[in-house]
């Protein structure tokens, strides 16, 4: 067992050119808080993953201001170390995320608003009970400065912790294969703590809280005898040949504990033993509970209420995230219909719609034609979120009020004259050609490309076009 | 101008199920979470469960067995149904909105008077 | 889950004169996550205070909210005649979501 500490000595601007505008204004106070989380392993993991080693929160740092027309300082920090203990052997290499957190203090709506202002992660090996070491990390145009190390909570004591030592009790020496702590020589190595109820007399461990069988011995807690001697596989398949009686696979084969967790069999199943910081069944919650206020921007915590369960944020309309730490662009949804224009006002989304549409989302079709009248007889069609008059002949323009020329289109063919005329046109067909609009040619031998003509209509009589 | 209108029988029989319905007008449905709160004559306001209109639904554990909130987006409504009623689900229930700054109240109903009796 | 006790039960004051209203939470509220809201006899509550300390809008500046943590104060600093009603407070730190039992503000 232990604590990894972290002190951050400094968050302001990194060298070099394109210095940031100070997160801080005289309109909007701020202060800075941060967040570390720490990963076993050289893991590459995402941001969201667990931090199966521990996350701490730091206090919030004092309230800013910003001088106007300086530069953005170094921030003012918050007082104190971020602390992660952990309950277990301390892996030697570990990843980390630090994230700086602004709390902005202005008149907002709902309370203070948080957003994430910058996130380093980085990967390191570090031995407990080493000094301290120093680290600088940039993000985007800010830096971090800042120191980490791990040490050991007594009694534990080593590069991974898991060393246990105690007060000598003789003045001279340590017990039988006992060995002097350094650098602690005034205690002694304590012998290693196997796991509860491990067989003192067919058992052993060689680290804290296993349990490894002597031969002939089997189950986790080395009390199950083996029929024969010559069962030296502990776990293997029961042999015909040899007659040996071994348990199958046993619930805590593969450790199904999460986050360094160790399992014990019970009588239906089996139990783990959790790491402090983490809960549930298989350790796999981590131990943030709704106490911490883990949820930002107006977000509820919900669950969470004791450690043993996990927390979920419900986060307001307009953020997202794990812990509602993030704005939605939530124009990018396309939620406006019928090619109505987004605006993503903060507290509300509004659509602004098209002619012809209407809704919180421009979702309903207006009628168009409703209070329009085509002039003289046309009929109104809808389309498109705008209305169109289908006019009666001899008329035209957007509601049939003008009177048309119907023959300004030049509608009969092959040189035939046109006339109006009060119900439509008459195409007067130049000679060889018939048809409403002269289109058809009349054939030398009397025959047109036509049915036989209506009696008392002769080729090249005018045709009307009705 | 958003308001809110409940609607719904007033008298329950004890072990029925009670079922109101929430209009919603001046507001999307689809841009707030919408609430259910009660009110028993005389007493104090007892938060009864929250939906999202992506289904996203959160109830009081003292009520969480018994009660279902709906969402429909088309009717701009939602709706609350509480089974196996009992003299003391007896209250005025109301329909709130959910602020987009937190989980409190900015608009209600005028609220609807439940009794349940046989 | 936050129990929040309200104090004191009754408040009997003249117009004109100061109310101080009490909400002590079982456990901290984080971010000031606290609302109250003023109810009349036969209509729905209504919100006056959001984030501990901001208004509503519409809601006179008579009207002012304080606090933190675990204890917090909503402060009418002249009684109006249509001030005297049942005051709730309300978190919305983490779920359950919970009310205070009132305090009614009733004319002497």
């Known amino acids: 067992a232990g604590v990894f500490e972290l002190q951050i000595h400094s968050f302001g601007p990194g060298p070099g050119p394109g210095a940031p505008r100070s997160p801080c204004s005289a309109r909007l106070p701020c202060r800075l808080f941060f967040r570390v989380c720490l990963k076993p392993g050289l893991s590459e993991e995402a941001a969201e993953s667990p931090c199966a080693l521990g996350a701490a929160l730091s206090a919030r740092g004092p309230v800013y201001t910003e001088q106007p027309g300086a530069p953005a300082p170094d921030l003012p920090l918050p007082d104190g170390l971020l602390q992660v203990p952990f309950r277990d052997a301390w892996p030697g290499t570990f990843s980390f995320i630090i994230e700086t957190w602004r709390e902005e203090l202005g008149d907002q709506i709902g309370g203070p608003a948080w957003s994430l202002l910058a996130r380093v992660a980085g990967r390191r090996r570090l031995a407990a009970g080493g000094p301290w070491a120093r680290d600088i990390q940039r993000a985007g145009a800010w830096e971090l400065r800042f120191s980490y190390r791990a040490r050991c909570e007594p009694p534990a004591v080593g590069t991974a912790c898991t060393r246990l030592c105690r007060p000598r009790s003789a003045p001279s020496r340590c017990g039988p294969g006992l060995r002097p702590c350094a650098p602690l020589e005034d205690e002694c190595e304590a012998p290693l703590v196997c796991r509860a109820g491990c067989s003192p007399e067919h058992g052993f461990c060689e680290q804290p809280g296993e349990c490894r069988c002597l031969e002939g011995w089997t189950g986790p807690l080395c009390t199950v005898p083996v029929s024969t001697s010559s069962c030296l596989s502990p776990r293997g398949p029961s042999s015909a040949t040899t007659g040996c009686l071994v348990p199958g696979p046993g619930p805590c084969d593969g450790n199904p504990c999460a986050n360094g967790g160790s399992c014990s069999e019970t009588p239906r199943s089996f139990e783990c033993t959790c790491p402090r910081g983490f809960y549930g069944l298989r350790c796999e919650v981590s131990g943030v509970t709704c106490a911490d206020g883990p949820c930002f921007n107006g977000g509820l915590c919900v669950g969470g209420a004791d450690p043993d369960s996990a927390y979920i944020c419900h986060c307001p309309p307009g953020f997202q995230g794990s812990n509602c730490e993030k704005r939605v662009d939530r124009c990018s949804l396309q939620p406006c219909r019928n090619g109505g224009l987004c605006l993503d006002l903060g507290h509300a989304l509004r659509c602004r719609c098209r002619a012809g549409f209407a809704g919180p989302r421009c979702e309903h079709d207006l009628d168009d034609c409703a209070g329009r009248a085509c002039a003289n007889g046309g009929t109104c069609v809808e389309g498109g979120g705008a209305h169109r008059c289908s006019c009666a002949l001899g008329f035209g323009g957007r509601d049939c009020r003008e009177r048309a020329d119907p023959c300004a289109a030049r509608p009969c063919a092959h040189g035939g004259r046109c006339y109006a005329h009060f119900s439509g046109l008459v195409c007067a067909c130049a000679p060889g050609y018939m048809g409403a609009r002269c289109e058809f040619p009349v054939h030398p031998d009397g025959a047109s490309a036509l049915p036989a003509a209506p009696p008392g209509l002769r080729p090249g009589d005018p045709q009307r076009y009705l | 101008q958003v308001q809110l209108q409940e609607s719904g029988p007033g008298l329950v029989k004890p072990s029925e199920t009670l079922s109101l319905t929430c209009t919603v007008s001046?507001?999307?449905?689809?841009?707030?979470?919408w609430s259910w709160i009660r009110q028993p004559p005389g007493k104090g306001l007892e938060w009864i469960g929250y939906i999202y209109y992506s289904g996203t639904t959160n109830y009081n554990p003292s009520l969480k067995s018994r009660v279902t909130i709906s969402v429909d987006t088309s009717k701009n409504q939602f709706s609350l149904k509480l089974s196996s009623v009992t003299a003391a689900d007896t209250a005025v229930y109301y329909c709130?909105?959910?602020?987009?700054?937190?989980?409190?109240?900015?608009?209600w109903g005028q609220g609807t008077l439940v009794t349940v009796s046989s | 889950e936050i129990v929040l006790t309200q104090s004191p039960g009754t408040l009997s004051l003249s117009p004109g004169e100061r109310a101080t209203l009490s909400c002590r939470a079982s456990?901290?509220?984080?971010?000031?996550?606290l609302a109250w809201y003023q109810q009349k006899p036969g209509q729905a509550p209504r919100l006056l205070i959001y984030?501990?300390?901001s208004r509503a809008t519409g809601i006179p500046d008579r009207f002012s909210g304080s606090g933190s943590g675990t204890d917090f104060t909503l402060t009418i600093s002249r009684l109006e005649p249509e001030d005297f009603a049942v005051y709730y407070c309300q978190q919305y730190d983490r779920s359950p979501l919970t009310f205070g039992g009132g305090t009614k503000v009733e004319i002497k």
């Open positions: 984030g501990a300390s």
């Open positions: 709130a909105r959910i602020a987009v700054a937190g989980f409190f109240f900015d608009y």
């Open positions: 456990q901290s509220v984080n971010k000031n996550y």
């Open positions: 001046g507001a999307s449905i689809s841009s707030f979470y």
